[in-house]
């Protein structure tokens, strides 16, 4: 059979031949003629035999990284019969690991991210470097990790790469570092070989610091004419930390007027001081309030950094502004009779100059022929007043400062004209009416209805009766309804066309004013050739063409 | 054409050590079997061994005891090493090329040989 | 080992001659791995036969070889002045190789 033993070749020889190690027959007894041949890949290229001996060299310079182990096919034959002493058997040759390869991180670039005042332990990162030496010959891929560039800050466990945080960092003091660490292989022994990194490790930030007040002191102005909302003036707080760590409310924390407001600009992290009242300078020309400041989130277990907020005063100065005259009252209301005489008392409107020097006042009235107003703000009449033609009036009243004719107020001013019993009471309507010749006594022939243009106070309440002489010598009566109408009734029976077609009928009205009014009113009664059934309907027919020029027979 | 030349010392000390060098010219050393063949005055050849061109070698028994061969590729020539030498190893020294790869050949060429003499 | 053994160990003939060298192995040589060298006093070896019987390049042929197993043959049918030397035989089918003690060929 085939003797052998394991064959190998170190890597990377320098040597042009190296002799790997010799096939042979157990039946080679050193003077057969026996031939030994070799095959397979890398036979006779990497791999050459002597074929008289069965030695076996390595011309070729091996990397067992590149390829380990060679696979080939040995045969002996004997030269003197040309056959086969031996089975053509499969060989291995291994290529022995040098190490000749260093440590190599392949994940790099290396970035960790690691909270600032992390405790002493916090892992970091994992580093980890691969050797492409034969993990299980020797030392050679077996790795020691070190630290070359990072302490005190950082330490690195030796077999496993982790890496670990032994001391605590600000990262308001430095944000980032540079860490080195090396990886030797031969676990650090001599003739190791080495590969470094770099790893970058951030501080990311927690809030670890409050808000505090740039100015321990902020003086600000607010002009008196400001109107509420207005920001008068920005405060600002810095804070060490960074992002959301960084964001800010700002709030009043002593403000006895109530006067202000801050709210937070969350973009830029201003404080911004508000007016939640008007203020007057002639009133209150300067306040004095107290703001605070606080991070908007904090931990719980970050509350140390916390307790206490910062503050700072505010000083407000009021700046004084020229402002138009202040009526007393927002709108008047004032009352005057009908008909009284033209520069009768209307009333007296009052406004002043708020500011120190209390500039006199000069009034007006926009366009009005009916009103007239002095200098002490006094409202006359310039014409009788009709109630009946306009009840009311609105006036516009400006008052002017004299010193300053730009500063001008304006207010309404309501005139209500009041109401005298200045009219008689009359008919609501034209009356046309008719009565049959044959019309029997007591026959309605119209009923009628009053308006009195006075305004009542109570309610009207209207009188109807006939003149004393149509009383006397009346073919008709009338009967008051007790309702503001009345009934004029037949007081004969019969009416003859051809004698009396006509008859007209003073009715006096009045009314329940004081003093009272009475009004004389006609009504015009046409007596009718009516058919049988006494209907008037034909006779106001034919009154109907005669008026538009017809004649009927 | 492939020529062969042997050189060393042509006069030796007994049982000292013995180096003689051949160096090919007109083709490469790489490829071939290289054999020493020595004769003794008056008397027949007689084979050393040869070393193949990766360095392995095969020695005659009579003398595989004192006898190294090396090669150098890289300046195409083989050595001869012969140690403890006697009287009896006085000869001309031949430097010849076997075959290449395979079973062994003849001698084809042959250096024109260097006398040895052992002698104190 | 293979010894070879050649004879005669004188051989004296004028030239035009024809000329028979014996080699004679202890055991078969494998193969016909024979081979026949010429050599001239003062000069290195040459290469005549190889495999018993197959003339090497640029050789006469008036040298032919023949011969299997243990008994081979070197006949030179017509000898030239240029053809008295020494001859040697060579087995080269075992190791160590072996070389025959030589014949020497010489002008009666």
């Known amino acids: 059979g085939w003797v052998w033993n394991q064959f190998f070749v170190p890597e990377e020889m320098n040597t042009t031949s190296h002799h790997v190690g010799r096939l042979r027959s157990d039946l080679d007894n050193g003077n057969n003629s026996f031939q030994y041949k070799l095959l397979g890949a890398g036979a006779g290229s990497t791999f050459i035999i002597d074929e008289r001996t069965g030695d076996i060299y390595a011309i070729e310079k091996l990397d067992r990284e590149e390829r380990s182990l060679y696979i080939l096919r040995a045969q002996v034959i004997d030269i003197t019969t040309g056959r086969a002493v031996e089975p053509e058997s499969e060989f291995v040759i291994k290529v022995s690991d040098i190490n000749d390869n260093e440590p190599k991180f392949l994940d790099e670039p290396y970035e960790a991210i690691v909270p600032e005042m992390s405790p002493e332990g916090t892992l970091v990162i994992q580093v980890t470097a691969s050797d492409a030496d034969d993990p299980s010959s020797g030392n050679n891929a077996r790795l020691l990790y070190s630290l070359l560039q990072g302490q005190p800050y950082f330490s690195v466990e030796p077999t496993t790469g982790v890496i670990r945080i032994s001391s605590k960092m600000d990262r308001e003091l430095q944000d980032e570092y540079w860490v080195i660490i090396q990886a030797k292989d031969m676990i650090g022994q001599p003739g190791a070989l080495s590969g470094t990194t770099s790893v970058l490790i951030k501080l990311s930030d927690v809030n670890d610091n409050k808000p505090i007040f740039k100015e321990s002191l902020y003086r600000l102005t607010v002009s008196e004419s400001a109107p509420t909302g207005t920001s008068i003036g920005t405060i600002m707080a810095y804070d060490n930390d960074i992002g959301e760590n960084a964001e800010m409310d700002y709030s009043i924390e002593e403000d006895d007027s109530q006067t202000f407001d801050i709210i937070t600009n969350h973009e830029t992290q201003e404080g911004i001081v508000i007016l939640k009242k008007k203020v007057n300078f002639e009133h209150q020309n300067h306040y004095g309030i107290r703001a605070k400041v606080k991070n908007h989130h904090v931990d719980k277990q970050l509350m140390k950094y916390h307790t206490e907020a910062s503050t700072t005063f505010i000083k407000i100065q009021v700046e004084d502004v020229d402002e138009p005259p202040l009526f007393l009252l927002p709108y008047y209301i004032f009352e005057i009779f009908e008909e009284t005489p033209q520069g009768s008392f209307v009333g007296v409107v009052s406004a002043t100059d708020p500011d120190n020097r209390k500039s006199p006042i000069r009034y007006s009235i926009t366009r009005s022929k009916v009103f007239n107003i002095d200098d002490n703000g006094t409202i006359t009449t310039t014409n009788s007043l009709d109630r009946e033609i306009s009840a009311w009036y609105n006036l516009s009243i400006t008052a002017t400062e004299k010193y300053n004719i730009e500063q001008i107020s304006s207010i309404p001013v309501y005139v209500q004209v009041l109401n005298i019993n200045d009219h008689a009471p009359e008919f609501s309507q034209y009356y046309e009416s008719y009565v049959c010749e044959n019309a029997g006594s007591g026959q309605v022939i119209q009923t009628i209805s009053a308006v009195d243009r006075d305004e009542s106070i109570e309610e009207h309440h209207f009188y109807f009766n006939l003149s004393v002489e149509d009383t006397n010598s009346s073919s008709f009566t009338i009967i008051d309804n007790q309702d503001n109408t009345a009934v004029i009734l037949t007081n004969r029976t019969g009416f003859n066309l051809q004698e009396e077609p006509i008859f007209y009928i003073s009715i006096l009205i009045a009314d329940n004013g004081i003093p009272s009014l009475t009004s004389t009113n006609t009504l015009t009664i046409h007596v009718c050739d009516c058919d049988d059934s006494g209907s008037t309907q034909t006779c106001q027919y034919q009154e109907l063409m005669l008026s538009m020029g017809f004649k009927t027979e | 054409q492939v020529q062969l030349q042997e050189s060393g010392p042509g006069l030796v000390k007994p049982s000292e050590t013995l180096s003689l060098t051949c160096t090919v010219s007109g083709g490469s050393i790489s490829g071939y079997y290289w054999s020493w063949i020595r004769q003794p005055p008056g008397k027949g050849l007689e084979w050393i061994g040869y070393?193949?061109?990766?360095?392995?070698?095969n020695y005659n028994p009579s003398l595989k005891s004192r006898v190294t061969m090396s090669i150098d590729t890289s300046k195409n020539q083989f050595s001869l090493t012969l140690s403890s030498l006697t009287a009896a190893d006085t000869a001309v020294y031949f430097c010849?090329?076997?075959?290449?790869?395979?079973?062994?050949?003849?001698?084809?060429?042959w250096g024109q040989g260097t006398l040895v003499t052992v002698s104190s | 080992e293979i010894v070879l053994t050649q004879s005669p160990g004188t051989l004296s003939l004028s030239p035009g001659e024809r000329a028979t060298l014996s080699c004679r192995a202890s055991?078969?040589?494998?193969?016909?791995?024979l081979a026949w060298y010429q050599q001239k006093p003062g000069q290195a070896p040459r290469l005549l036969i190889f495999g018993a019987s197959s003339r090497a390049t640029g050789i006469p042929d008036r040298f032919s070889g023949s011969g299997s197993g243990t008994d081979f043959t070197l006949t030179i049918s017509g000898l030239e002045p240029e053809d008295f030397a020494v001859y040697h035989c060579?087995?080269?089918?075992?190791?160590?190789?072996?070389f025959g003690g030589g014949t020497k060929v010489e002008i009666k």
């Open positions: 010849a090329r076997d075959g290449s790869s395979g079973w062994y050949r003849w001698f084809d060429p």
């Open positions: 070393i193949y061109y990766i360095g392995s070698t």
């Open positions: 060579q087995q080269y089918g075992n190791s160590p190789l072996t």
């Open positions: 055991q078969s040589v494998s193969s016909s791995y």
